[in-house]
Interface confidence: medium
């Protein structure tokens, strides 16, 4: 069954090596977790704690402002995407602890591991929307004065979520629960029914739409924004540059291992040594991608501290200051400090 992929999202091919055999002495196979799996568990635990608390705080701070403040709408939606993904972590964590055994049933198998992919697409589409917003603020300030409103922002977010759901459907549809009887194990994964071309197509679409195309467009977009804002003495600051780079880079940094291993595995033969090595690293790559779900609140706080000089305010008020200040378009076509600051925030992992 060379097309069955197990564990979390869609890579990490089916592998029934790790088992919990009864009446068998403890050995490296049956009762010990691989080092990459242990690292993945540590990352999952940290991401869950920081991601749930941090994103809940961001949602709480931005929800009150989202009716009137466009930046709050962006950050609210990103935080919701991250928060949803974090909710799947305890189950994914439990599955790895149980050597990838999946006792949670078919519905959970279809839905929960798909959440990180929904998060990936939702985040990148929301980031693209936010980047477009930043771009328009810099290059079309008059248009923004006339048309940039909360209603349009919510419509843009709805479109982003709709497209994200659409792009997650293939993963959702191909997910199945699969059971071995010797050694006894239930696995959750993707079954492409021996169709290697279909598997490659899914991997390529995910790489292009979830990584390469956004990387290209956002790099171009932020290059133009930075060139324009840097040319203004008032906003020429390495601080702004660093934060903007953090905003754009983190998404791609944390998704890179998952995307690279995924595309490689879709083209490799399951018997090749490289394939087998990548297969062992699957959970670690997924956990690395999951860092995106907790990095936003951290960047918001770090950025907020930077703008405040030092942490003088309470965390909610600091976050409110960073996330809900509205960008004011000036007639001179430059924009306020708050615009530069909020543009620099990590809106999730672009």
């Amino acid at each position: 069954m060379n097309s069955f992929n197990y564990t979390t999202p869609d890579y990490g091919h089916y592998d029934d090596k790790d088992t919990l055999d009864l009446n068998t002495p403890v050995d490296k196979t049956s009762n010990t977790l691989r080092v990459p799996d242990i690292l993945a568990l540590v990352i999952f635990a940290v991401v869950f704690l920081v991601g749930v608390l941090g994103n809940a705080l961001v949602v709480w701070v931005t929800a009150f402002e989202a009716k009137r403040t466009i930046n709050a709408i962006w950050f609210l939606n990103l935080a919701v995407a991250d928060f949803l993904s974090c909710l799947a972590l305890p189950i994914l964590f439990t599955s790895i602890v149980q050597h990838h055994h999946w006792p949670f049933g078919g519905a959970a198998c279809s839905i929960l591991p798909s959440l990180i992919l929904l998060n990936m697409y939702a985040s990148i589409l929301l980031l693209a929307t936010i980047s477009a917003d930043r771009f328009l603020l810099v290059f079309k300030p008059i248009w923004c004065q006339n048309f940039r409103g909360a209603g349009l922002a919510w419509i843009a977010c709805a479109v982003a979520w709709g497209l994200a759901l659409l792009l997650t459907i293939p993963s959702f549809l191909y997910r199945v629960v699969r059971e071995e009887y010797f050694p006894p194990k239930v696995l959750c994964g993707v079954d492409y029914s021996h169709d290697k071309r279909r598997e490659r197509a899914v991997a390529i679409v995910r790489l292009v739409l979830g990584f390469l195309w956004p990387l290209l467009t956002l790099t171009i977009c932020y290059t133009f924004i930075l060139l324009r804002t840097w040319s203004r003495r008032a906003t020429r600051s390495t601080k702004t540059l660093k934060v903007v780079v953090a905003v754009v880079a983190s998404f791609f940094i944390f998704w890179l291992p998952y995307q690279v291993t995924g595309i490689m595995m879709s083209f490799l033969e399951p018997s090749s040594p490289t394939f087998l090595l990548l297969n062992k690293l699957d959970s670690l790559c997924v956990s690395f991608a999951y860092i995106n779900c907790c990095i936003n609140p951290i960047i918001y706080v770090v950025a907020g501290q930077g703008f405040q000089g030092r942490l003088r305010k309470s965390l909610p008020s600091l976050l409110r200051n960073v996330l809900t200040e509205e960008s004011v378009v000036r007639e001179s076509k430059s924009f306020t400090r708050s615009t530069v600051d909020t543009m620099a925030q990590k809106t999730q992992a672009v």
Epitope: M1, F4, K17, D21, T24, V177, E180, F182, P270
Partner: antibody
């Protein structure tokens, strides 16, 4: 189409060794345990052990430790079982088997056609 | 090791009549994950064993509905509602809950 094709019948003298092969196709050979089962003439089935071709890890039924040695070659998707110090009681049909797996898409249980090993002086 | 005891060892049946084979294990076959890994195989003359029933009562793909399995813990039964000529062979029960995997000694079904 999944297939497990075993090598042909062997006749060996007591004290000799024999190596039975099992060529797999149609599934991820490297990532799945391969089992070996013995069936003496007119007798029941006995599980010998299993090998994980991906890294050569093995698990043996205590009864066959020292008698059977399982190996695998992932480049040819072939599993091997060598029986050493053959005695008359080793005369049997030996099967390779990829035991049951069930999913919403598929349900399979693969057995090779069996290899008859006859030990006779 | 878990000892699997089948009865009867020989079962002559008239075509169209029902048949029943019993299998008893020396230990409970309930796995820590809650499943019971007790399976039934049929080995037709000159062939490899083929799976009929898995996990006590689940018919394997392509197996006629005249075959059914039941039982729990240590006692299990395979029933054939109406025996047909193609059902002739040796029936084995097997457990994969505990290592090593073990089989019953087999029940030979023959037509009267």
């Amino acid at each position: 189409q999944v297939q497990l094709v075993q090598s042909g019948a062997e006749v060996k003298k007591p004290g000799a060794s024999v190596k039975v092969s099992c060529k797999a196709s149609g599934y991820a050979f490297s990532n799945s345990w391969m089992n070996w089962v013995k069936q003496a003439p007119g007798q029941g089935l006995e599980w010998i052990g299993r090998i994980y071709p991906g890294d050569g890890d093995t698990k043996y039924n205590g009864k066959f430790k020292g008698k059977a040695t399982m190996t695998a070659d992932t480049s040819t998707s072939t599993a091997y079982m060598e029986l050493s110090s053959l005695r008359s009681e080793d005369t049997a049909v030996y099967y390779c088997a990829r035991f049951l797996l069930i999913s919403t898409v598929t349900a399979v249980d693969y057995w090779g056609q069996g290899t008859l090993v006859t030990v006779s002086s | 090791d878990v000892v699997m005891t089948q009865s009867p060892l020989s079962l002559p049946v008239t075509l169209g009549e029902p048949a029943s084979i019993s299998c008893r294990s020396s230990q409970s076959l309930v796995h820590s994950n809650g499943n019971t890994y007790l399976h039934w195989y049929l080995q037709k003359p000159g062939q490899s064993p083929q799976l009929l029933i898995y996990k006590v009562s689940n018919r394997f793909s392509g197996v006629p509905d005249r075959f059914s399995g039941s039982g729990s813990g240590t006692d299990f039964t395979l029933k054939i509602s109406r025996v047909e000529a193609e059902d002739v062979g040796v029936y084995f029960c097997s457990q994969s809950t505990l290592v090593p995997l073990t089989f019953g000694q087999g029940t030979k079904l023959e037509i009267k």
